[in-house]
């Protein structure tokens, strides 16, 4: 006996079309673009039913259901807006992702996604992955362009990248992105195999304040060219945090230098160092201090450190020097690992040019200078570590 005439589901069609369907005859269902074959909620690759000898089809009719991309996934540090209509997530619907203003900016694409026939939200570039809200770097409340000696008190938001590192000794670092800290290798060398021993604090001005954002280290990466207790060449390290920190006006990453950054770091250009290191009174600072200091001619600095007790070649091409010939303004013990920052007048963002590394025994001494790791020499190293881990 013939099987019942197959009625195509809405937005679908039957093939082949026959006057009647008898034993072993079959039909398939094909859906229009933007509609998918569904049995329940599960997608079917194809659908073919066969007429059985009892005059019934061997499979129930599927549905041709409009493709529904479903509620879009949450975007960390961002939000999503339904453009087509409130909660509309079906074929050709449009949504717009955006990042939390001021502190995050969108990477990868423009944030506009369309629900495509394959059931996935897809960007105009064809990407099915979420955009990325990347922290904006180099924002500071300051409008003017580890070791702070002869400095001034910092105000909230002046140095939001400043990180206090406790673990054996007091040191500093600078926040990169939202889960990395840039610091000096010598400051964290002892903890390289025990990263969890590092107590990392940010978002505070007062060294002893109980009000701070706590972060913990997942791993410490010391530059492979750094040799402990044998000079300070390659005195640079990265700390990976075990969680992303929330960016706000008091916690903001510092920018890495662009290729053009050296034009803002010539001799006599002013950089700013900040930290809780020893002050003129000989104690660690309670309040975050900062000092504006000029870059010193490299040859001049090399010469200053060629006299005993400094071994020849103490100052290398991987270092830069800053300070006043007359002394009085310097970084000092406790400031190690902090950032020497410069204002990029083109982007109006602050970037890290140096890392507080070493200097004369007597901070702020005339004719001696603070020596900083030259960050621009290590951009490939930094980028490789961050992309690999």
């Amino acid at each position: 006996q013939p099987c019942p005439y197959p009625m195509a589901p809405p937005n679908g069609h039957v093939s082949p079309v026959q006057a009647k369907y008898i034993l072993k005859d079959s039909f398939s269902i094909f859906c229009e673009t933007g509609y998918e074959l569904l049995q329940g909620h599960l997608p079917l690759k194809s659908f073919t039913a066969v007429c059985q000898k009892d005059g019934s089809w061997d499979r129930p009719m599927p549905a041709c259901s409009i493709v529904d991309c479903g509620p879009p996934d949450d975007l960390p540090s961002g939000r999503v807006e339904y453009i087509t209509g409130p909660g509309v997530t079906t074929y050709k619907a449009v949504i717009q992702y955006s990042c939390e203003e001021t502190f995050y900016t969108m990477k990868v694409n423009d944030g506009k996604y369309v629900c495509e026939a394959d059931g996935f939200w897809t960007s105009s570039k064809g990407e099915k992955s979420l955009p990325v809200c990347e922290p904006v770097c180099g924002l500071s409340a300051r409008t003017t362009g580890g070791r702070i000696y002869g400095g001034q008190k910092a105000k909230p938001g002046d140095f939001p990248w400043q990180v206090l590192i406790l673990g054996g000794t007091t040191a500093a670092g600078a926040l990169l992105y939202d889960n990395w800290v840039l610091t000096a290798a010598h400051a964290v060398y002892e903890q390289k195999h025990d990263a969890s021993a590092l107590d990392i604090r940010m978002g505070t001005l007062k060294r002893l304040s109980p009000h701070y954002t706590q972060a913990w280290s997942e791993a410490v990466f010391i530059h492979e060219g750094y040799t402990h207790d044998a000079g300070f060449d390659n005195d640079i390290a990265l700390i990976k945090l075990n969680n992303k920190v929330v960016i706000n006006s008091n916690i903001t990453p510092i920018c890495l230098p662009r290729k053009e950054a050296e034009s803002f770091m010539r001799t006599d250009d002013i950089g700013t160092a900040s930290g809780w290191g020893l002050t003129q009174r000989g104690f660690l600072a309670r309040n975050l201090m900062y000092v504006d200091i000029p870059i010193v001619d490299h040859q001049k600095c090399t010469a200053a450190y060629e006299k005993p007790p400094y071994p020849r070649g103490s100052v290398t091409a991987n270092m830069l020097c800053a300070g006043l010939e007359s002394g009085g303004k310097d970084s000092c013990r406790g400031d190690a690992g902090g950032a020497l920052v410069f204002l990029d007048s083109e982007t109006e963002r602050w970037f890290v040019g140096g890392i507080v590394s070493w200097g004369s025994m007597n901070c702020g001494e005339a004719g001696q200078y603070g020596v900083y790791t030259k960050v621009i020499n290590y951009i490939p190293w930094i980028e490789n570590i961050i992309s690999d881990f």
Partner: antibody, heavy 118, light 106 residues
Framework: QVTLKESGPVLVKPTETLTLTCTVS??????????VSWIRQPPGKALEWLAH???????SYRTSLKSRLTISKDTSKNQVVLTMTNMDPVDTATYYC??????????WGQGTLVTVSS | QPVLTQPPSLSVSPGQTASITCSGE??????AYWYQQKPGQSPVLVMY???QRPSGIPERFSGSNSGNTATLTISGTQAMDEADYYC?????????FGGGTKLTVL
Amino acid sequence: QVTLKESGPVLVKPTETLTLTCTVSGFSLSRGKMGVSWIRQPPGKALEWLAHIFSSDEKSYRTSLKSRLTISKDTSKNQVVLTMTNMDPVDTATYYCARIRAGGIDYWGQGTLVTVSS
Amino acid sequence: QPVLTQPPSLSVSPGQTASITCSGEKLGDKYAYWYQQKPGQSPVLVMYQDKQRPSGIPERFSGSNSGNTATLTISGTQAMDEADYYCQAWDSSTAVFGGGTKLTVL
């Protein structure tokens, strides 16, 4: 971002009932064609699908375990619960909850190891 | 429930192509899905609906499915691809997994 986290006892006695909870975030249990699946993996063995539940409350179970399994969801708590009665040592496994999307199981929890022993 | 059969193990040298097969009756009529599982970790979806790569999965992973066999191909295999791989399909609203293939990168 999308996360799923399993919770429940790590040790169950034979004949007891196992109750596992999957807490989800980053997606909705009430809208779209999203589902949550439970899958288990005995030590050193292959993955075994157990059950799933969709936003519409459509449920499905592994045929051989159908009489022992119950899956449900609490949308307000963003939770999916699996109960498995009459536990046996052969049910010792890591139990995963995972999201179903476009037929694929695209996000998995970290899994919870359940040992059945007296 | 229908059975999906995978070879228990497969060894390839770095840079070579690995082809992991999954066979089942009329599997080509259904969508095949593939998962990668590294020791001590949860599985990761590496291929959906036969040949679609989820975001974040390298282009060296590709898939095909016809007749009775679905294949996951890894071209230019890397050491990091060493893992167990499982195929999966849906049959009448129930999921079926293959027995898994242990891929060793020599």
